[in-house]
């Protein structure tokens, strides 16, 4: 008997497991800079981190997770969106670099946003037309009476036992799926060696199935993304984020689950389920 249905069942199981684990994943935050990402020396810049409603801490990370700034001054931009603003009043060369956002929405931390590269250049006489991710201005803009600068926020903690079991379970299912696929491929090879397939359809169908699975997964991932969140108030001074100046930018993939080097505030148990990190680098022209 052909293992065709078995392989399909394996794929369906795999798919169901993946979608199940994605069920409670948080949407990635977005990051933008105002007035842009190319800033004259001495001018101000505001990083805007946006995420879903209910975010309690937004973190702006610079270059690596060891340099970050937290704010709990989160504004509700709309019934389904929240944002925080991190302002640098007087940009120095040391502020140039890669920035990204991450947020804490109980009981867990989100993935990081894409990187945004801040370029600092010498002030020139003429007006700038900086490369920027345009922000949609929606609703009244109020200024808060204080710019709280919160140093620490709860860091992602180690895996709890139950999460370890889930992880092992997912791994086992994944390996089982791989094994099924390998066996299926071997079986197909044997069939090919033994003689030509009975019909064209029979040859094509197995190759189409994985694509279908990938397509469903991609659409699931798309649905979890929140984009184009409007702007609102709250700004936090981020001058503490200024680190050593660097002429060249090194793109490094950072471990999302590594503990930060700062002392992190104790927090009640939270889900620390690892997730595949898809890093997109913001391509910005140097002037």
């Amino acid at each position: 008997m052909s293992p065709h249905p078995t392989a399909l069942l394996g794929l369906v199981l795999c798919l169901a497991q993946t979608i199940h684990t994605q069920e409670e994943d948080l949407p990635r935050p977005s990051i933008s800079a105002e007035p842009g990402t190319v800033i004259p020396l001495g001018s101000h810049v505001t990083f805007v981190c946006r995420g879903p409603v209910g975010v309690q801490t937004f973190r702006l990370e610079r270059d690596s997770r060891s340099t970050y700034n937290d704010t709990e001054d989160v504004s509700q931009a709309s019934p389904s969106e929240s944002e925080a603003r991190f302002r640098i009043d007087s940009v120095r060369e040391g502020n140039a670099g890669l920035y990204r956002c991450i947020y804490y929405k109980p009981p867990k931390w989100s993935e990081q946003s894409d990187y945004l590269e801040l370029l600092v250049k010498e002030s020139s006489g003429g007006p700038d037309s900086p490369d920027t991710e345009p922000g949609s201005s929606a609703g009244p803009t109020q200024r808060p009476s204080d710019n709280s600068h919160n140093e620490h926020a709860p860091a992602s903690q180690g895996l709890k036992a139950e999460h370890l079991y889930i992880l092992i379970g997912v791994s086992v299912v994944f390996l089982f799926c791989l094994l099924l696929l390998v066996l299926f491929c071997l079986h197909r090879q044997n069939q090919i060696k033994q003689g030509p397939p009975r019909s064209k359809d029979e040859e094509q169908k197995p190759q189409q199935r994985p694509d279908l699975a990938v397509d469903v997964l991609e659409r699931t991932a798309d649905k979890a993304t929140v984009n184009g969140l409007p702007e609102k108030d709250r700004e936090t001074d981020t001058s503490a984020l200024a680190a050593g100046s660097s002429q060249e930018v090194t793109y490094a993939q950072l471990d999302h689950w590594a503990l930060t080097q700062r002392t992190a505030r104790a927090v009640s148990p939270q889900s620390t389920k690892p997730m595949a990190e898809s890093i997109t680098y913001a391509a910005v022209a140097r002037h």
Partner: antibody, heavy 121, light 109 residues
Framework: EQSLEESGGDLVKPGASLTLTCKAS?????????MCWVRQAPGKGLEWIAC????????TYFASWAKGRFTISKTSSITVTLQMTSLTAADTATYFC?????????????WGPGTLVTISS | ELVLTQTPAPVSAAVGDTVTIKCQAS??????LAWYQQKPGQPPKLLIY???TLASGVPPRFKGSRSGTEYTLTISDLECADAATYFC???????????FGGGTEVEIK
């Protein structure tokens, strides 16, 4: 309409244990909320006890004074319980169940009417 | 641990007056506040969350604001139905916990 109702309040002796139950109507627990317990001693203020995450994981949050003696758990997608042990007269209060939802930035809404727990010998 | 201190203790005002209740947070972390109204024999009712956002169905006579670590609930055009005890609460799931203030009773003259 979304509502909550507590049950299990009783008159018990010091040192006894008691389990309170909160049942949701009009909604079931989801990954965007927490189910919480708050108590209020007669003529006193509100005192937060504990919360449990409504999603797949069972993340729990406790007031520092409540750790150890109190246990919060989800028994179904619409019920949450609060187990209390080694009860003393100081635990005499009306116990409220409330939902803490991200849409209200985790403000507690709705609340149940409360169930009275009296500890007396 | 976060401590929320509410002042004044009891407030007495006439119908049509404006009443201001303050809630002072002991630290500037995780202190986005919610305000509740509680009448005798009833559970509390959410009025304001995220320090200044009105909860559904709450009249705009109730206004929340923040200045540093001081949070204010202002009730304008006071009505008889506003006679109640008002509580502030930190709605942060971090180490501060979900602390409540001691409560402020508002009575109508």
């Amino acid at each position: 309409e979304q509502s909550l109702e507590e049950s299990g309040g009783d008159l018990v002796k010091p040192g006894a244990s008691l389990t309170l139950t909160c049942k949701a109507s009009g909604f079931s627990f989801s990954s965007s909320e927490f189910m919480c317990w708050v108590r209020q001693a007669p003529g006193k203020g509100l005192e937060w006890i504990a919360c449990i995450y409504g999603g797949l994981s069972d993340d729990t949050y406790f007031a520092s004074w409540a750790k150890g003696r109190f246990t919060i758990s989800k028994t179904s997608s619409i019920t949450v319980t609060l187990q209390m042990t080694s009860l003393t007269a100081a635990d005499t209060a009306t116990y409220f169940c409330a939902r803490s939802c991200d849409v209200n930035y985790y403000g507690f809404d709705p609340w149940g009417p409360g169930t009275l727990v009296t500890i007396s010998s | 641990e976060l401590v929320l201190t509410q002042t004044p203790a009891p407030v007495s005002a006439a119908v049509g007056d404006t009443v201001t209740i303050k809630c002072q947070a002991s630290q500037n972390k995780g202190t986005n506040l919610a305000w509740y109204q509680q009448k005798p024999g009833q559970p509390p009712k959410l009025l304001i969350y995220l320090s200044s956002t009105l909860a559904s169905g709450v009249p705009p006579r109730f206004k929340g604001s923040r200045s540093g670590t001081e949070y204010t609930l202002t009730i304008s055009d006071l009505e008889c139905a506003d006679a109640a005890t008002y509580f502030c609460q930190s709605t942060y799931y971090g180490s501060n916990g979900l602390t409540f203030g001691g409560g402020t009773e508002v009575e109508i003259k």
